[in-house]
């Protein structure tokens, strides 16, 4: 988790002088509770946005937006702590909005936004906005949390982000798999424009089962520059097992930008359709 590196982060708006600061996720008001604390945020919304760095790289970011409740506690609101927690790694990153002037009620509801937390493709997050100061130990909570899911690199907008392109999202191998005689599969795919090796992983399954009955790995050496964007054809020999008829072919590239963590592409060959048992043809014709 990190913050997007472009521009000075701003939270000021007409009628409010505000600065964005890094935070340890442990606000001082936890340690030194205050008697009077503001109410919780209202209508917290988290959306996926995209933003460029100063270097021109495009990253997915969490766009966080919330409003203030229209009660008197606005007079005691000193700022907000924004926290993003990556669920599986338990990694947390926080920033603090520090209000340098007192908030006053005005003709429309106060609204705040922040779009600088960089998020990873295909990951899950919890976003929390805490109003400051935080409540006394037994006080009513004054935060709001929402979970947030980032699409993977198959998603149209995600595909062109820097982290997705680094893991090979622009490579479309257009895999075709053809069943040949004598228990063989012909796999064909388009090579990318990099001199890197590939691996074909074949997993076979019985019809309607999810436990594999055959696995095979085939190594494809790095192509020469004149072979870039050309089709590579490989013939794989299957184990002659009755009913082991559904085949999943997965191609794993080893591009320099993602090494052994590149996006894999796969194709599946289903078991052949079993024809309905035909009616037996009688060997004589009745005469009625």
């Amino acid at each position: 988790l990190r913050l997007l590196d472009h521009r000075a982060l701003v939270c000021s708006q007409p009628g409010l002088n505000c600065t964005v600061k890094n935070s340890t996720c442990l606000d001082d008001s936890w340690i030194h509770p205050r008697n009077l604390t503001p109410s919780s945020p209202k209508d917290l919304q988290i959306q996926l946005h995209f933003a460029h760095t100063q270097q021109g790289d495009l990253f997915p970011v969490a766009h966080i937006e919330w409003t203030l409740q229209t009660d008197a506690s606005i007079l005691y609101l000193e700022g907000a702590e924004l926290s993003v927690l990556q669920l599986n790694t338990n990694e947390r990153l926080c920033v603090r909005f520090e209000f340098l002037s007192k908030l006053r009620h005005h003709h429309r509801r106060w609204r705040f936004t922040f779009s600088h937390f960089v998020v990873d493709p295909d990951q899950e997050y919890e976003v929390t906005v805490h109003h400051l100061p935080k409540p006394i130990p037994d006080g009513d909570p004054n935060h709001q949390s929402k979970n947030f899911l980032v699409p993977d690199c198959e998603h149209a907008r995600m595909k062109v982000t820097t982290p997705c392109m680094s893991s090979g999202s622009l490579w479309d191998p257009n895999i075709t798999v053809e069943t040949l005689e004598a228990h063989q599969l012909r796999v064909s795919f388009t090579l990318w424009n990099e001199s890197t090796h590939y691996q074909i992983l074949l997993t076979s399954f019985p019809h309607m089962e999810n436990h594999s009955c055959f696995e095979h790995m085939h190594h494809i050496p790095a192509p020469r520059p004149e072979e870039f964007h050309q089709r590579s054809n490989v013939t794989l020999t299957l184990r002659n097992l009755k009913g082991c008829c559904r085949h999943q072919v997965q191609i794993q590239p080893f591009f320099s930008s993602c090494l052994n963590d590149c996006l894999r592409h796969s194709a599946t060959v289903s078991c052949p359709e079993m024809p309905d048992t035909p009616e037996p043809i009688p060997d004589y014709m009745p005469l009625w």
Epitope: N88, T89, K146, N147, L149
Partner: antibody, heavy 116, light 107 residues
Framework: QVQLVQSGAEVKKPGASVKVSCKAS????????ISWVRQAPGQGLEWMGW????????NYAKKFKGRVTMTTDTSTSTAYMELRSLRSDDTAVYYC?????????WGQGTLVTVSS | DIQMTQSPSSLSASVGDRVTITCRAS??????LNWYQQKPGKAPKLLIY???NRESGVPSRFSGSGSGTDFTLTISSLQPEDFATYYC?????????FGQGTKVEIK
């Protein structure tokens, strides 16, 4: 091919404990959390909690807090769910699933029967 | 906890029919909703995530829509393999609660 393979059916007496395992393959184990969901016979799905495969951090549904423990073994890419002080209404199929918010791959389920 | 209410609890339909299942949340959950399909004796299968995104490999006849508190799963042309029970699940806040399920039966 992503696969989650669970341990076999169990029959337990009331008051006993059960430990269900869930072995994952076909993806980077520490990239996604593991959730546990149960389903009583003829009933709907009930979320029990999840565990981070990266940090071991857990998040349990209130109903199961104090009675459930979720753990992982990174060396074998296996998650475990232990439920203690079993009651007859814990009779259910227990599923593990990959991820926390979007449960995209599921184990085949483990039937736990609690009967005296 | 957020309550999820599905309707109808069961329905009868024929192959080729257009089927609509609705799910209502007890509070605003944005688009934080998934749909699952479960066949007897099998584990649930993810169909739609984040209200409207079809999971990889799911046929295009399945679609999801809605935001806030009201959501819909639509099967545009029911196929024989679609007869199953369907569950919605919210993940805006933990615990991730499920609807009670909608059983789609053959008419």
């Amino acid at each position: 091919q992503v696969q989650l393979v669970q341990s076999g059916a169990e029959v337990k007496k009331p008051g006993a404990s059960v430990k269900v395992s869930c072995k994952a393959s076909g993806y980077a184990w520490t990239r996604y959390g593991i959730s546990w969901v149960r389903q009583a016979p003829g009933q709907g799905l009930e979320w029990m909690g999840w565990i981070s495969t990266y940090s071991g951090n857990t998040n349990y549904a209130k109903k199961f807090k104090g009675r459930v423990t979720m753990t992982t073994d990174t060396s074998t890419s296996t998650a475990y769910m232990e439920l203690r002080s079993l009651r007859s209404d814990d009779t259910a199929v227990y599923y593990c699933a990959r991820r926390v918010l979007r449960l995209d791959y599921w184990g085949q389920g483990t039937l736990v029967t609690v009967s005296s | 906890d957020i309550q999820m209410t599905q309707s109808p609890s069961s329905l009868s339909a024929s192959v080729g029919d257009r089927v609509t299942i609705t799910c209502r949340a007890s509070q605003d959950i944005d688009s934080s909703l998934n749909w699952y399909q479960q066949k007897p004796g099998k584990a649930p299968k993810l169909l739609i995530y984040a209200a409207s995104n079809r999971e990889s490999g799911v046929p295009s006849r399945f679609s999801g829509s809605g935001s806030g508190t009201d959501f819909t799963l639509t099967i545009s042309s029911l196929q024989p393999e679609d007869f199953a029970t369907y569950y919605c699940q919210q993940w805006a806040n933990m615990p991730g609660t499920f609807g009670q399920g909608t059983k789609v039966e053959i008419k």
